[in-house]
């Protein structure tokens, strides 16, 4: 079997260890006898058999340390894990998630009070007591709060006509309150009577365009923790009640609002004061804030827009969408069902991703089934425990900084596991921690450039021109991202990631992200392009390789030769083609146009004798077989049968 340790010509201890978890480096002074290259790097057993003493071998091992003292978590254990990794190695540990029997519940109603919601808001007057009784079996400690939203109070979202600016719904013959971005009306309270009074006092408002400013309001409700009164220990439910879609980031450019949403709380006297100066949040930003603040969202949607919200669910973890009946009759049922579903689902997400560290998480559900961690387990009861098998891998050793941490967070839980990553990338012989030994293979040293003395080497800079470090004479040295050493670029180490290439022109942080992970966590970034691990493909490694087979038509062609396969779906590159396999292209067949008269001859049914005669004379030389496949489509194509 190939021994990559010995065959890769590793010139230094660090390079050797980076080759793979099986490689070791011998620091013994008198180890190299014949001067053959890279004898110091080999499999540990080989080094020993070649005469290297065990205590002279640099071979950092993988450690998983789980401190048992000071464990404060009750639902997610262990709360902290320390992992020592070396290149190519992986470490394993088990994470337990144990839902509590009963959680306090904070339920905040965020209600679209635009005019079309008139009937639904009336129902809110009576939800409190009924809901508290229905939720009593799930939680003893139940609080309700309330806030209202409409949209950004600028044109073209609201009417700025003087007669309508204060009453947007004169069309409905209603006396409306002025439009607003978001108003926090009632902080979370266990006093149901107070909640019902606040809802009873709520007046309808209005605006012009169909989408509302729901995501603006949601973000504020999520991040303004002290205003809303969210409790640390509670399950936090944000019920968004609406009958329309929501504006997304960039929509507000239409009103000249171009400052990106900063994701912070901007409530002054319970009113969102940045509504008219800051953009709507993006879905990614909203998702991040909801997860960070342990908010589970229930979209309670009436009417046709229910599916718009349902389609968002994969992008907003810990979110549920339910359809409300007319006058919101089933609103409480929706809350109870959603809560029952939320507390019976346990899934995790990796946050604070560490550059170059890869997590593979498998949930082991109470029924014994195994699921990917992001999918997690369903039908989990409070007596159950969900186990997550976590595998942490470090592919390479090219990231600066020795110690880092990631966070594994069960969605909707207020506890996390902090995973400290220690990269064993350097050798003891390099930093005087251990006995002084050979950290560089002397057979590699270029005497013209390296001047070595007692295992310390320095460079003789003057002998080399910096021109060899430029991709073009007009370009900066090493693309401005490195220094020229011995005529070669040594690229800067930066926090964003790795800069590399002959002229430091490449990097590994400008690749596309998918669900917050670089290359979806299924590949490595090289020169701005995702290089996918085996079994994954797509521009961001987001697609399982098997997905490609869904793009092959009955003739074995990928997307009929008119498109590319993206995650098992054809994206037609020819704008004229449509269909699952881009198979329909009414205007593609120039062969049909050019030879239309002769095409008839291939399907001679119901042709007059005159035309049949013409077929024999004018079209006799036509290579009919060549067109058969295409013509069958010509004749089935509506555009040719008109």
């Amino acid at each position: 079997e190939d021994n990559r340790c010995a065959s890769s010509n590793a010139a230094s201890c660090a390079r050797c260890l980076a080759l793979g978890p099986e490689c070791g480096w011998c620091v013994q002074e008198d180890f190299i006898s014949g001067g053959s290259r890279s004898e110091r790097c080999d499999i540990v057993s080989n080094l020993i058999s070649k005469g290297c003493s065990v205590d002279s071998i640099e071979y950092p091992s993988v450690h998983v340390i789980i401190p048992t003292e000071n464990e404060i978590n009750t639902q997610v254990t262990p709360g902290e894990v320390s992992i020592q990794l070396r290149p190519g190695a992986e470490a394993n540990f088990m994470l337990k998630v144990h839902p509590l029997k009963k959680y306090p519940v904070d339920l905040y109603y965020l209600v679209d009070v635009s005019a079309s919601m008139h009937n639904n808001i009336e129902k809110l007057n009576s939800v409190g007591n009924d809901l508290s009784r229905k939720m009593a079996f799930f939680s003893r400690d139940f609080r309700l709060g309330f806030g209202s939203y409409v949209d950004k109070t600028v044109s073209p979202y609201i009417s700025i006509h003087p007669e309508r600016i204060h009453n947007q719904c004169s069309d409905y013959n209603l006396d409306c309150m002025p439009p607003h971005g978001y108003i926090h009306v009632l902080s979370l309270t266990e006093n149901i009577t107070e909640f019902e009074k606040a809802v009873h006092r709520q007046k309808i408002s209005g605006n012009i365009d169909t989408p509302e400013g729901g995501f603006d309001a949601m973000l504020q409700a999520a991040v303004c923790e002290s205003h809303i009164g969210w409790r640390k220990e509670a399950k936090r439910l944000l019920l968004v009640m609406t009958d329309q879609t929501s504006h997304l980031a960039l929509d507000s450019k239409l009103a000249g609002i171009v400052v990106p949403n900063d994701g912070n709380c901007h409530l002054k006297n319970n009113v969102y004061v940045k509504s008219t100066t800051m953009e709507h949040p993006s879905l990614g930003q909203l998702s991040e804030k909801l997860i960070d603040n342990n908010i589970n969202v229930i979209f309670a949607v009436q009417g046709k827009q229910f599916h718009w919200y349902k389609d968002l669910l994969p992008l907003l973890p810990g979110t549920i969408a339910g359809e409300i009946e007319s006058k919101a009759a089933n609103l409480n049922n929706l809350v109870v069902e959603a809560y029952q579903k939320l507390i019976s689902e346990v899934k995790v997400q990796v946050e604070n991703q560490v550059q170059g560290i890869y997590f593979n998480i498998t949930a082991i559900c109470p029924d014994g089934s195994r699921k990917p961690g992001m999918e997690g387990c369903r039908n989990v009861t409070s007596n159950d425990e969900v186990l997550f098998n976590v595998t942490v891998t470090m592919k390479k050793c090219d990231v600066t900084g020795g110690k880092n941490y990631a966070i594994i967070k069960p969605i909707g839980f207020n506890e996390t596991a902090k995973i400290h990553i220690h990269r064993n990338c350097s050798c003891q012989c390099e930093d005087n921690r251990g006995p002084k030994g050979k950290c560089v293979d002397e057979t590699f040293l270029d005497s013209k450039c390296f001047q070595c003395d007692e295992n310390k080497c320095h460079f003789d800079e003057d002998q080399f021109s910096s021109e060899s470090c430029k991709s073009h004479k007009d370009q900066p040295v090493c693309s401005g991202r490195g220094v020229c050493v011995c005529g070669k670029c040594s690229c800067h180490k930066i926090k964003l990631g790795k800069v590399y290439g002959k002229y430091c022109e490449k990097d590994d942080f400008s690749c596309p992200y998918h669900h917050g992970n670089l290359c979806a966590g299924h590949g490595e970034c090289e020169a701005g392009r995702c290089q996918c691990f085996s079994g994954w493909e797509g521009d961001r490694c987001q697609c399982p390789s098997a997905a490609a087979q869904h793009c092959v038509n009955s003739k074995g062609q990928v997307c009929s030769g008119r498109g590319t396969c993206v995650c098992g779906r054809c994206e037609c590159t020819d704008p004229r083609s449509i269909g699952r396999f881009c198979e329909h292209c009414p205007t593609c067949y120039t062969a049909c146009k050019e030879n239309w008269n002769c095409m008839q001859c291939l399907h001679p049914h119901n042709l007059s004798q005159a035309i049949l005669d013409q077929c024999k004379t004018s079209c006799a030389l036509m290579e009919q077989q060549h067109y058969v496949d295409q013509t069958s489509e010509c004749f089935s194509s509506p555009s040719y049968l008109r």
């Epitope: 229905k134 009593a136 079996f137 003893r140 149901i192 009577t193």
Partner: antibody, heavy 115, light 107 residues
């Protein structure tokens, strides 16, 4: 631990009123709904009504409306159920119970109505 | 009011048996259905809430299922202490209503 203690058995005349008490301990009295249920000998259970002491909200079964009055006295952590215009059909065991995930039913108060 | 129909009204089974009691409602109660056990001495305990959730401290031999208007309580591996009358109760709409009860006896 949730505990409820009801008042003792009652022997009443037809047309009179009876007031049964139910003292709660082991939890925050104002936050739990208290249910009242009637069971005639050899019969099933019949819901009379309930109250949430914290808000004063009370709901009744239409069948008992006007005759049953459910109240709660927060200082003494006690709920009361008064039933007026008693008839022979009111000879029954009356239960008070907490509502929710730590539901607890007391052993009941026996009321006998005679002439 | 929502009417609750329990069946059978009584049943006799042997120790170790599995028994099922049904409860039918006159309209959809959206799983807002509880099962109670009343022992011969009058003691009432909650067994199942929200149609299928086992109440704390109740043996796992008891299980509830159903949706819409049809619900059931199953007791597996019958034990002597299961001799009791079992009631279903809906709490979807006021007034809350109980089923007529099912008296379980041991053969």
């Amino acid at each position: 631990e949730v505990q409820l203690q009801q008042s003792g058995p009652e022997l009443m005349k037809t047309g009179a009123s009876v007031k049964i008490s139910c003292k709660a301990t082991g939890y925050t009295f104002s936050t739990y709904w208290i249910e009242w249920v009637k069971q005639r000998p050899g019969h099933g259970l019949e819901w009379i009504g309930h109250t949430l002491p914290g808000s004063g909200t009370t709901n009744y079964n239409e069948k008992f409306k006007g005759r049953a009055t459910i109240t709660a006295d927060r200082p003494s952590n006690t709920s009361y159920m008064q039933l007026s215009s008693l008839t022979y059909g009111d000879s029954a065991v009356f239960y008070c119970a907490t509502w929710g995930w730590d539901t607890y039913w007391d052993h009941g108060t026996s009321v006998t109505v005679s002439s | 009011d929502i009417e609750m129909t329990q069946s059978p009204s009584s049943l006799s089974a042997s120790l170790g048996d599995r028994v099922t009691i049904s409860c039918s409602t006159s309209q959809d109660v959206s799983s807002y259905l509880n099962w109670y056990q009343q022992k011969p001495d009058g003691t009432v305990t909650l067994l199942i809430y929200y149609a299928s959730n086992l109440h704390s401290g109740v043996p796992s031999r008891f299980s509830g299922s159903g949706s819409g208007t049809d619900y059931s309580l199953a007791i597996s591996n019958l034990e002597p202490e299961d001799i009791a009358t079992y009631y279903c109760q809906q709490y979807s709409n006021l007034p809350y209503t109980f089923g007529g009860g099912t008296k379980l006896e041991i053969k």
